[in-house]
Interface confidence: medium
């Protein structure tokens, strides 16, 4: 029996269901008697799902699993993750028995966007150019840890002072604030990208400063 | 490379029970399946049955089933037969086998190096 | 339970002797068969599985055939260290069955 995965990872958003693809060509004749399906995490080995002597052995993952049982007397071992979490990311192995064995890993990359940043400025009245200013950008849920730019006005990289820190929350999404310290000029804006290296999605905030008043 | 090693001879009266150990190391042991393989003296070899440690699913051959268990405990990688009510027809070398990592679970490429099991009065 | 029946049960043959074993089952096991060399005190070694692959490491003047029923094991030019027990098994069901062996001793 030849066992057969996507070699890409699967890409699943935080609380929605990811599906792990894992596929057998079944000989003729075949019964699901004969079937042995495990899946497991492949590195520490622990049970997620399985299905042996003839029937659904159930889900030993936080019950959050599940076969397509219609599909798999077609070959179809895959498996069904339900409301996936930060702590499912990882490589999954579906090892397929029937006489032969085989076995073949899929990994589940987790993800989640990053919200709009929200941009703060200190301190934010009676500023003058030449003024040293802490601009922050904060942007917060996502998964996995950002990339964050800065650039000024006409689009080129602020890479000066900048210290940027993410914290996981209890859920294992990252909170992201990065602050840039500059000199202000006469006008001038500040532009902040959050950037989900797994979705490749941009979330971008600003700041304009025209001497009096602010914009964002 | 999976070695199996197994606990040591033992003589056995009728009509009480016996429970051999097998060792596994150099292989992923609680994914794949372990079979117990019984020799007599001078004959061939007989399928007892097998577990898989990962699931803690055993199955007999009907021939030895109410008076075999097989169990597992993953976190020192050996498996147990344990026969119960032995008869002298029971003496037998006893092996436990598995494919391995990258084989079957019903073909054996490693075997470990047999335990006698002697019943007598 | 399916039935397996080796054939003979004793050979006797000389170095560089080209051997065959039959091995019979009592039903259609497909190609779920696997042959196996014991020598005395050991245990037994995986030669043959899936009626036809050589299993790694095995030397190639070992081969297998057959299919269904009736399936076969042929050492080409027999070595002095092939004089041993040889052990068809099937795998298409439960419970797995051996064939009674087949001694290939020194004439």
């Known amino acids: 029996v030849e066992v057969q995965v996507s070699e890409d990872p699967v890409v699943a958003l935080v609380d929605t269901d990811a599906t792990l693809r894992c596929s057998f060509s079944p000989e003729p004749g075949f019964s699901l008697r004969q079937l042995n399906l495990i899946w497991q995490l492949t590195d520490t080995k622990q049970l997620v799902h399985s299905f042996t002597e003839g029937r659904d052995q159930g889900s030993a993952y936080a019950n959050r699993t599940a076969l397509f049982p219609d599909l798999l007397v077609q070959g179809n071992a895959s498996l069904r993750l339900q409301r996936v979490r930060v702590t499912d990311e990882g490589s999954y192995t579906c090892f397929v028995s029937i006489q032969d064995f085989d076995s073949a890993a899929v990994s589940l990359q987790v993800a989640a966007p990053y919200s709009k940043p929200s941009m703060t400025l200190e301190p934010n009245k009676d500023l003058r150019p030449g003024d040293m200013v802490t601009i922050t950008c904060s942007s917060y849920q996502g998964y996995p840890e950002a990339e964050v730019f800065w650039k000024d006005g006409q689009g080129l990289p602020l890479t000066g002072n900048v210290t940027t820190s993410q914290m996981a929350n209890e859920r294992g999404l990252f909170d992201v604030h990065s602050v840039l310290r500059v000199v202000l000029g006469a006008n001038g804006t500040y532009s902040c990208l959050v950037r989900n290296p797994v979705l490749q999605q941009d979330a971008h905030g600003s700041v304009t400063i025209t001497g009096q008043p602010m914009t964002f | 490379q999976v070695q199996l090693v197994e606990s040591g001879a033992e003589v056995k009266k009728p009509g009480s029970s016996v429970k051999v150990s097998c060792k596994a190391s150099?292989?992923?042991?609680?994914?794949?399946?372990i079979s117990w393989v019984r020799q007599a003296p001078g004959q061939g070899l007989e399928w007892m049955g097998r577990?898989?440690?990962?699931?803690?699913?055993?199955n007999y051959a009907q021939k030895f089933q109410g008076r075999v268990t097989i169990t597992a405990d993953k976190s020192t990688s050996t498996a147990y037969m344990e026969l119960s009510s032995l008869r002298s027809e029971d003496t037998a070398v006893y092996y436990c086998a598995n494919g391995g990592d990258s084989s079957s679970w019903y073909t054996f490429d490693y075997w470990g190096q047999g335990t006698l099991i002697t019943v007598s009065s | 339970d399916i039935q397996m029946t080796q054939s003979p049960s004793t050979l006797s043959a000389s170095v560089g002797d080209r051997l065959t074993i039959t091995c019979r089952a009592s039903q259609n096991i497909n190609s779920w068969l696997a042959w196996y060399q014991q020598k005395p005190g050991k245990a037994p070694k995986l030669l043959i599985y899936?009626?036809?692959y050589l299993q790694t490491g095995v030397p190639s003047r070992f081969s297998g055939s057959g299919s269904g029923t009736e399936f076969t094991l042929t050492i080409t030019s027999l070595q002095p260290d092939d004089f041993a027990s040889y052990y068809c098994?099937?795998?298409?069901?439960?419970?797995?069955?051996f064939g009674g062996g087949t001694k290939v001793e020194i004439k």
């Open positions: 098994q099937q795998y298409d069901s439960n419970p797995l069955t």
């Open positions: 577990i898989i440690p990962i699931l803690g699913i055993a």
């Open positions: 150099g292989g992923t042991f609680s994914s794949y399946a």
């Open positions: 899936k009626a036809s």
